[in-house]
Interface confidence: low
Amino acid sequence: DAHKSEVAHRFKDLGEENFKALVLIAFAQYLQQCPFEDHVKLVNEVTEFAKTCVADESAENCDKSLHTLFGDKLCTVATLRETYGEMADCCAKQEPERNECFLQHKDDNPNLPRLVRPEVDVMCTAFHDNEETFLKKYLYEIARRHPYFYAPELLFFAKRYKAAFTECCQAADKAACLLPKLDELRDEGKASSAKQRLKCASLQKFGERAFKAWAVARLSQRFPKAEFAEVSKLVTDLTKVHTECCHGDLLECADDRADLAKYICENQDSISSKLKECCEKPLLEKSHCIAEVENDEMPADLPSLAADFVESKDVCKNYAEAKDVFLGMFLYEYARRHPDYSVVLLLRLAKTYETTLEKCCAAADPHECYAKVFDEFKPLVEEPQNLIKQNCELFEQLGEYKFQNALLVRYTKKVPQVSTPTLVEVSRNLGKVGSKCCKHPEAKRMPCAEDYLSVVLNQLCVLHEKTPVSDRVTKCCTESLVNRRPCFSALEVDETYVPKEFNAETFTFHADICTLSEKERQIKKQTALVELVKHKPKATKEQLKAVMDDFAAFVEKCCKADDKETCFAEEGKKLVAASQAALGL
């Protein structure tokens, strides 16, 4: 449905508040270094222009595309070349190349200062003094640090952020009320950002077909009572929403997401019995709730899959007629029967089935050729099951911190060229799979663990893509989306790696470590552990454990000392010498 003015259409659909918030998110995700005030000024100019178009859709420039309008606005920034370097060259291009150029310059790891949380009273004063600016600043700070954050979901986070301040700034104990809520929002926000980053990587690096396959599998698990046609419709609409958001078309994305939520709620009887509660909520909560809704119960008495996909004489005929539809039906039928499998496992099974049909439907006796295809699934299913069992046992034995350390050592030995901060961040997140998933019963462990690992390994892939240093990482990241985790799992110690020169400065610590939070202190220790492994990749677990135990004791001792700095200097030298001796450095 063509509109004379796209900007007027979106302004009317979304309302002024959401329009302004989404434009701010879009601009902050593109120009990540620009000051807040500059972005607010640009957003206000765009909003005023949109209002003129609402008043008269035939007014000058109102017929221009959103990319043209937004791109023109971004290209008015005076300091574009000084701040962004070659990104300024995007402005010499025409649409759609200009937008593609901006997208390519999005930085997953922007050089921005860490967000430091002010005192609660300071935050509450700022919130009360100017609520609108306070909330805009939240959107801006999150969007510029997470350039692929799912924009309509960020509006939901902002709503909860506002609710937390509204409630807690009136509470008797503001900090006790507010800080847990902010911690929760921060952790959930990071998780949401990482999940969305995988969706965008899937679309951008592997294409729409890969994303649609993922969506078929996930929605079929979630809505097993829905018919294939219904799931297909939802997949098509969901793909459009995420393609738009990943492409920077945030107004269209938010609008289409709202339409999709409306459709799901109007048709919940043919989709899922679990949607009732979600559908009673306001829009932002409703969309979030639908995205997180639990799997519906599987229909009783589902027939065997073999009848239609192995035993039938029409398998090759059906496959030849409409390959992707037939494979989609296979994936739908398999996924709705297996909420206990990870999505990536279901996609590996579908790929195996596709490869078998490609080969067998060209054979002399196709049926004889593909008759045992389901037998090929067994090892594919057992591999993640065994891996999760072993790692959950290790997690239960070690606890989260030491489990993270085991993964740090494992991954540093696999890909020692990767930067230490990236190895620490990724291994810490990989280690969180234990507390996140091992508590679940077996039927929920694999979807929890393997799909979470896909999200974390994608973080490694996007960070590594910015500055590639390891052919092994590149290979695992680019060959197959669904086999990334098995690819990394299969990597052994990199025998070609030349150990890093020993640098005592890396292992010099100061009294400031004593004032750090437990988490920050862990990161310091884990950073040292990675550096140790990079210096001595052949060190045994026992050697590393001994050094790390000594290190922990050293920190504890010096943090209790009267003259902390002297203790760190003197004891630190002894520790370095002892560690070198222990590791044979």
Epitope: R160, E184, E188, E277, C289, K439
Partner: nanobody, 126 residues
């Protein structure tokens, strides 16, 4: 479908303590926002305390803050309400309620909870 079964109610003197339990079946309790409500004779249902789905964010009514503690044991699939410094005005039937779908925020509105236990009576009297 979630089934909830409360226990632990009884007669207690003012200043005393009680611990209520709510055993859930049919759903993992850590994936559900759960809450305790109470209904005093001749009054409506009143929110007492709640805990979010999938997260341990707790909420309390002003009248019980500092005296009552809500918690859950995921391994036992059970919700608890530890009640200390009990007062006569705490006398009521206490109900456990659940909202599936991992809502992080526990609502204080009774009508948003589709699943309820049958209640356990707490009487505070000397």
């Amino acid at each position: 479908e979630v089934q909830l079964l409360e226990s632990g109610g009884g007669l207690v003197q003012p200043g005393g303590s009680l611990r209520l339990s709510c055993a859930a079946s049919g759903r993992y309790i850590d994936e559900t926002a759960v809450a305790w409500f109470r209904q005093a004779p001749g009054k409506g249902r009143e929110f007492v305390a709640g805990i979010g789905g999938g997260v341990d964010i707790t909420y309390y009514a002003d009248s019980v803050k500092g005296r009552f503690t809500i918690s859950r044991d995921n391994s036992k699939n059970t919700l608890y309400l530890q009640m200390n410094s009990l007062r006569p005005e705490d006398t009521a039937v206490y109900y456990c309620a659940a909202r599936p779908g991992r809502p992080l925020i526990t609502s204080k509105q009774a009508e948003l909870y589709p699943y309820w236990g049958q209640g356990t009576l707490v009487t505070v009297s000397s």
